[in-house]
């Protein structure tokens, strides 16, 4: 679960699993700075707000986030 | 099978020191937090630590903050926590658990920290 | 920081329903998991995300979660589930996780 208080890492466990896209509210990536030193994902879903850290080596999260941005693109006109 | 199984456990003086490991086996140790929670004799459940998947990140319950430090060896699977400064009031069952995000969906059986003189 | 308040028990009779009751300060906008520890042995996760399932936990175990209120509802009660319960959360503002006082469930 991320934790926003920190200015380190944020993610305490991360999912190999994707989520589905229809309960996503929101998904951020998150590039490595200075105060975390790797990609973190951050899917945010409808159900009250619940965070969930996904696994950027994950072949399937790969493969999520390739899916939700084929969508947007869709969407924008 | 998923297992967390905790070692370490003991009879310490106050001010002394104890170090509790465990050993988890079944799941991919490295993609996820671990907790440490304690049960004193007959109370409730208290959350102790956690720490992240990679070790960057780690909290601590106000009450051994400062005394007590979660780590994790990945290479290894296993779970540590290094319990300085002793009181009496440590005394109690100590389990690591799997974190869920934000739920606990796997214990160890637990090992019993004493302290007393 | 956050308190999460449970009745200390509750006596149920088998074949009935038992309600276990977990207040806490607009605890419905939060995520509440909750475990039953038996004598002698670790806690065990019943219900998580307010009123999902682990694989193995019986169809009789439900939970909900509004308002000031979270319950988990223990429907057929048998002897074996005679235990103490704690309800569970993730204090976002402090970054700690915090249970409940725990309720003692016994099977009259």
């Known amino acids: 679960v991320p934790l926003s208080r920190t200015v380190r890492c944020t993610c305490i466990s991360i999912s190999n699993q994707p989520v589905n896209p229809r309960s996503l509210e929101k998904l951020e990536i998150i590039p490595a700075s200075q105060f975390c030193p790797r990609v973190e994902i951050i899917a945010t879903m409808k159900k009250k707000g619940e965070k969930r850290c996904l696994n950027p080596e994950s072949k399937a999260i790969k493969n999520l986030l390739k899916a939700v941005s084929k969508e947007r693109s869709k969407r924008s006109p | 099978q998923v297992q967390l199984v905790e070692s370490g456990g003991g009879v310490v003086q106050p001010g002394r020191s104890l170090r509790l490991s465990c050993a988890a086996s079944?799941?991919?140790?490295?993609?996820?937090?671990m907790h440490w929670v304690r049960q004193a004799p007959g109370k409730g459940l208290e959350w102790v630590a956690v720490i992240s998947y990679d070790g960057s990140n780690k909290y601590y319950a106000d009450s051994v903050k400062g005394r007590f430090t979660i780590s994790r060896d990945n290479s290894k699977n296993t779970l540590y926590l290094q319990m300085n400064s002793l009181r009496a009031e440590d005394t109690a069952v100590y389990y690591c658990?799997?974190?869920?995000?934000?739920?606990?969906?796997?214990w160890g059986r637990g090992t019993m920290v004493t302290v007393s003189s | 920081s956050y308190v999460l308040t449970q009745p200390p028990s509750v006596s149920v009779a088998p074949g009935t329903t038992a309600r276990i009751t977990c207040g806490g300060n607009?605890?419905?906008?939060?995520?509440v998991h909750w475990y039953q520890q038996k004598p002698g042995q670790a806690p065990l996760l019943v219900i998580y995300y307010d009123s999902d399932r682990p694989s193995g936990i019986p169809l009789r175990f439900s939970g909900s979660n509004s308002g000031n209120t979270a319950t988990l509802t223990i429907s057929r009660v048998e002897a074996g589930d005679e235990a103490d319960y704690y309800c569970q959360v993730w204090d976002t503002s402090s970054g700690h996780y915090v249970f409940g006082t725990g309720t003692k469930v016994t099977v009259l």
């Open positions: 607009n605890i419905g906008s939060r995520s």
């Open positions: 658990a799997k974190d869920e995000f934000d739920a606990f969906d796997i």
């Open positions: 079944g799941f991919t140790f490295s993609s996820y937090g």
